[in-house]
């Protein structure tokens, strides 16, 4: 708390301007009226206040708005936003995308802070769903945003928003997240033709089931190895050698370099060595000829 001291004669602020940067902490507290500050918030960000001075201004706004700031103040917070705690932000009702953008701009170039995470959470909850414009904005500032959401949160993303997602936005997503996003992407891109569809769906394929991979293998898609390595192991295992060959096209040669890594390693173990040999890549570890393969998982399910 800043001590309450009388404002020195002639120092009472008539407006928020540059002269205030020369005010000491106690002078700002005593000489700047909170209501004046609130009505001239748009000027604050144009004045080179120090963090100490911003703390005083925040204190004044907190006293004026104990239940939380109105959006007219929030949209002009600028660097003052960096002084807000998640508890402060939970009191806000932010509805305008422009306000969200203005506040994200202040934190630009930095990882997502607890304040930003709280702000985004409040904004998205207020909207009820993660619409395309919001997703566009959030991924522009934080490419990893989508992958920071839980599968439950991702379930509120409408398929139409998937158009805003760029491949790099999915870089850090795990299989559970892609399991939720893939069906939405499939729905969003369903009216596209073969090659265009594959370009769009490619980065979501870590959530694709076996039957969809089989279908893609019939479409000459030439999937690259990086994409193949991100596929779900359980979705790759049932694919035949012929299907994988069709799926990868000319990239099939890359299997040799990845034969010790999942899902390639596990897939090799499930294939007949004869079939693997037809690829001419020297892949080893398949089922020797003449061996009978029992599907134990099927047997367990029956018992």
């Amino acid at each position: 708390e800043v001590e309450k001291t009388a404002c020195p004669s002639g120092k009472k602020a008539r407006e928020i301007d540059e002269s205030l940067i020369f005010y000491k902490k106690w002078e700002l507290e005593a000489c700047v009226d909170a209501a004046l500050l609130a009505t001239q918030m748009d000027r604050v960000n144009a004045i080179p206040f120090t963090y100490e001075q911003l703390d005083v201004l925040k204190h004044k706004l907190d006293e004026l708005y104990p239940q939380g700031y109105p959006e007219s103040v929030i949209q002009h917070l600028g660097y003052l936003f960096l002084k807000m705690s998640p508890e402060d932000i939970r009191k806000w009702n932010v509805t305008s995308l422009e306000t969200l953008k203005a506040l994200l701009e202040v934190n630009k170039g930095h990882e997502m802070s607890p304040q930003v995470a709280t702000l985004i959470d409040r904004f998205v909850k207020g909207r009820g769903q993660l619409d395309k414009d919001t997703l566009d904005t959030l991924t522009a500032f934080y490419p990893g945003y989508l992958c920071s959401l839980s599968p439950e949160e991702l379930s509120s993303v409408p398929p139409s928003s998937i158009w805003a997602v760029r491949p790099q936005d999915l870089d850090t997503c795990d299989p559970r997240q892609l399991d939720v996003l893939y069906p939405k992407a499939r729905l969003a891109f369903q009216n596209m033709n073969g090659s265009e569809y594959f370009v769009k769906i490619q980065s979501f394929l870590g959530g694709a089931p076996t039957e969809d991979l089989k279908a893609l293998s019939q479409q000459n898609v030439s999937m690259d190895l990086a994409t193949f390595m991100k596929l779900r192991t359980d979705a790759v295992l049932p694919l035949t050698v012929a299907e994988v060959q069709k799926l990868l096209g000319p990239h099939v040669e890359g299997l040799k370099a990845e034969e010790r890594h999942r899902p390639v390693r596990d897939w090799i173990l499930r294939q007949r060595q004869d079939d693997l040999d037809t690829l001419g890549l020297g892949l080893q570890g398949g089922i020797p000829n003449g061996y009978l393969v029992l599907d134990l998982s099927m047997q367990e399910a029956l018992s």
Partner: antibody, heavy 123, light 107 residues
């Protein structure tokens, strides 16, 4: 790339004054804050003050108040620091340093520094 | 003005060592703290800001932590090029002030 290029070394008599220049990148010249920091031989860093050309603001550390003046020439993207009534203890390397970003902010730490100008005050 | 103190004022260490330098402010500075490295005859080089954020291009062996009045700079595994003088700086209020420096020497 941000560059701050300072004028060359100076030898001055006690009681005289010195003017050090700091030429900055054109793109962010007026919007950024240029700070002046000095370092006496074998000593630490001492902040002298800052200038924000776009706002015509100069903020001087109390120890230098009345002896130091910062000016800016937008036509050449150059900031100047003039120190008067020189004494032997003003012998130091004088640095200009710029804050991050493309406009002023409260983040007054300094990713960009000039190479330094040695000012020697000796009779 | 906020006074900054650093400890130790000098320290000897070997390549590969883990080193910690402490900086204390005379009042709370809300993480408004930067760390610099300076080599003889050169301008200071920014290492970290906001107490713990690494400046781009700075090796990840440098890290910072702290809050309120007490802050630390840690070098996880000293490299030959790390022997230099280190300064902390508060930018919470004017006048912005620096610590007196910590000289890191080869043992």
């Amino acid at each position: 790339q941000v560059q701050l290029v300072q004028s060359g070394a100076e030898v001055k008599k006690p009681g005289s004054s010195v003017k050090v220049s700091c030429k900055t990148s054109a793109d962010t010249f007026s919007a950024n804050t240029i700070n002046w920091v000095r370092q006496a031989p074998g000593h630490g860093l001492e902040w002298m003050g800052r200038i924000i050309p776009s706002l015509n603001i100069r903020d001087y550390a109390q120890e230098f108040q009345g002896r130091v003046t910062f000016t800016a020439d937008e036509s050449t993207n150059t900031v100047y620091m003039q120190l008067t009534s020189l004494r032997s203890e003003d012998t130091a390397v004088y640095y200009c340093a710029r804050d991050p970003g493309s406009t002023w902010s409260p983040n007054q730490f300094f990713p960009h520094w000039g190479q330094g100008t040695l000012v020697t005050v000796s009779s | 003005a906020i006074r900054m103190t650093q400890s130790p004022s000098s320290l000897s260490a070997s390549v590969g060592d883990r080193v910690t330098i402490t900086c204390r402010a005379s009042q709370g500075i809300s993480n408004s703290l930067a760390w610099y490295q300076q080599k003889p005859g050169k301008a200071p080089k920014l290492l970290l800001y906001a107490a713990s954020r690494l400046e781009s291009g700075v090796p990840s062996r440098f890290s910072g932590s702290g809050s309120g009045t007490d802050y630390t700079l840690t070098i996880s595994s000293l490299q030959p090029e790390d022997f230099a003088t280190y300064y902390c700086q508060q930018y919470y209020s004017t006048p912005f002030t620096f610590g007196p420096g910590t000289k890191l020497e080869i043992k």
